[in-house]
């Protein structure tokens, strides 16, 4: 006869490990007992369990409540046991010793490998600002056994660097993603991808990039100066900019206070029916936590009567 077992049994932390040991005997051979022990190098054998043909299952005190026989139906030549709720400390070498009649004793060894799936964590780097050089966007750390793989999935251009720390029964891997911040990266996803044999599928943690910036300010509304004449209604100036975080707007008049009746509505300055007193230099102040910008325009309100008089003069002069 001969013993059938596995060289390596792999199980995920917390799962039950089946330690196989099957005696393939000749006709008429009987198994008297199967003794299981842990036999790590450099340490004495530690008894695990005894499967006895007459007495049944005995579990040694150190493994009380954690070793069982596989559920029925059972073959009397099958000395396999279940190690419940595998923990990292269970990883190691195990031996089954089978006492048979009349063939004698047989033994076989297997290695139990306990996979510890990682629980990854993603830590954003310092605040990203346009104009910075190469900056840490995020770091991702995952610890497991064996060492997990940590990669990045993103459309953003950047560089990665990884380092690994070995512990007694596991390894921690940290990967950093560096980039040169630009406003085009704003809102883009940066995904840490962790792979490990103990995971059914890759674990993904996504971080949305936020890059602080403030665009140059400009004012719209004066494209056609002829529209800015006395009596015109609905005239307005709009301040144009964009930023992250979104900017706030403030309007002032350089050559005095804002005329009465002029309404400030965020980025928009609304005028009542125009009069000559609305002429002046207007300044739009745009600011966010990152920066501030100014843009100024000169409003010159035309008097249509003056204009028509001049035209008449011109005509008569001709």
């Amino acid at each position: 006869g001969e013993l059938e077992t596995s060289d390596v049994v792999t199980v995920v932390l917390g799962q039950d490990a089946k330690l196989p040991c099957f005696y393939r005997g000749d006709s008429g051979e009987q198994v008297g007992q199967v003794a299981w022990a842990r036999v790590d190098a450099g340490e004495g054998a530690q008894e695990l369990a005894l499967l006895h043909s007459k007495y049944g299952l005995h579990v040694s005190p150190a493994y009380e409540g954690r070793v069982e026989q596989p559920p029925p139906p059972r073959n009397p030549l099958d000395g396999s046991v279940l190690l419940r709720n595998a923990v990292q400390a269970d990883e190691g070498e195990y031996e089954c010793r089978v006492s048979t009649f009349p063939a004698g004793s047989f033994q076989a060894r297997l290695r139990l490998r306990v996979l510890v799936p990682p629980l990854p964590s993603l830590n954003p780097g310092p605040a990203l600002e346009e104009g910075q050089g190469l900056t840490l966007a995020a770091s991702c750390t995952a610890e497991g056994s064996p060492a997990p793989s940590v990669t990045w999935d993103t459309e953003v251009k950047g560089t990665t660097s990884s380092r690994s720390f070995k512990h007694s029964r596991s390894a921690a891997v940290t990967s950093e993603f560096h980039l040169v911040p630009s406003r085009s990266m704003n809102g883009q996803p940066l995904t840490c991808v962790v792979s490990h044999p103990g995971l059914l599928q890759d674990q993904r943690i996504t971080h949305i990039l936020h890059v602080s910036f403030l665009a140059e300010a400009s004012v719209r509304g004066l494209e056609d100066q002829n529209l800015w004449h006395i009596g015109r209604e609905g005239a307005m100036l709009k301040c144009l900019s964009e930023g992250q975080p979104p900017p706030s707007y403030n309007w002032t008049r350089l050559d005095g206070p804002l005329p009465s009746g002029v309404r400030v509505d965020g980025d928009t300055l609304g005028f009542p029916p125009l009069t000559t007193e609305h002429s002046g230099i207007y300044v739009c102040h745009v600011s966010n936590e990152f920066s501030s910008r100014d843009s100024q325009v000169t409003v010159d309100v035309l008097d249509p009567q003056e204009d028509s008089g001049k035209q008449v003069d011109l005509v008569s002069a001709s």
Epitope: A35, L50, Y55, P61
Partner: antibody, heavy 126, light 107 residues
Framework: EVQLVESGGGLVQPGGSLRLSCAAS????????MSWVRQAPGKGLEWVSG????????RYADSVKGRFTISRDNSKNTLYLQMNSLRAEDTAVYYC???????????????????WGQGTLVTVSS | DIQMTQSPSSLSASVGDRVTITCRAS??????LAWYQQKPGKAPKLLIY???SLQSGVPSRFSGSGSGTDFTLTISSLQPEDFATYYC?????????FGQGTKVEIK
């Protein structure tokens, strides 16, 4: 025929010592684990100590731990129990017994006691 | 330690009676249980091992059953030589422990 013969019992004062012997014959002594079991007058059976075949693994009941020592001399087919610091509650008939040999090389369990000696009486009294 | 509780502690029966003695372990012991018979002034004698296996030379009127925590010794037809004290013993853990005994007396 398997025979186990105990000797060494007797009257001893509290705090005293005795050494019990058990001579085995009629079987291969080296192949069997052995135990000592005692029975106080009018009481039940109490396992005292046991030793595996090679003599390397000795176990004791809590009530005698640190005071009694079990040993064996396989060349003389003899089992011993050295009893020190004896107390009145150690008064009993002490039996040596052979353990049934159907569990191989597994120290965590003992086996049934298939042969017993006739017993030797130990009396601890002042 | 595992506690072994026998019942009854004594019983009176007549020759030819069927006698049942029970033994309960304080925790599961698979079939690591033996039964012994002891007569006054004599050493105990192994009757049953592995809960139900009859020791060589023991009459077939003795039988054992059970596993886990509950066990039974049955004498199918009591004979005059069977009047004695009976002990159960677990050997699942060290120390092995005995029941307190059941004395079978003549009615």
């Amino acid at each position: 025929e398997v025979q186990l013969v105990e000797s060494g019992g007797g009257l001893v004062q509290p705090g005293g010592s005795l050494r019990l012997s058990c001579a085995a014959s009629g079987y291969n002594f080296t192949s069997y684990d052995m135990s000592w079991v005692r029975q106080a007058p009018g009481k039940g059976l109490e396992w005292v100590s046991g030793i595996k075949t090679g003599g390397g693994s000795a176990r004791y009941a809590d009530s005698v731990k640190g005071r009694f020592t079990i040993s064996r001399d396989n060349s003389k087919n003899t089992l011993y129990l050295q009893m020190n610091s004896l107390r009145a509650e150690d008064t009993a008939v002490y039996y040596c017994a052979r353990e049934y040999s159907d569990v191989v090389d597994y120290v965590s369990v003992r086996t049934p006691l298939d042969y017993w000696g006739q017993g030797t009486l130990v009396t601890v009294s002042s | 330690d595992i506690q072994m509780t026998q019942s009854p502690s004594s019983l009176s029966a007549s020759v030819g009676d069927r006698v049942t003695i029970t033994c309960r372990a304080s925790q599961g012991i698979s079939s690591y249980l033996a039964w012994y018979q002891q007569k006054p002034g004599k050493a105990p004698k192994l009757l049953i091992y592995a809960a139900s296996s009859l020791q060589s030379g023991v009459p077939s009127r003795f039988s054992g059953s059970g596993s886990g925590t509950d066990f039974t010794l049955t004498i199918s037809s009591l004979q005059p030589e069977d009047f004695a004290t009976y002990y159960c013993q677990q050997h699942y853990t060290t120390p092995p422990t005995f029941g307190q005994g059941t004395k079978v007396e003549i009615k």
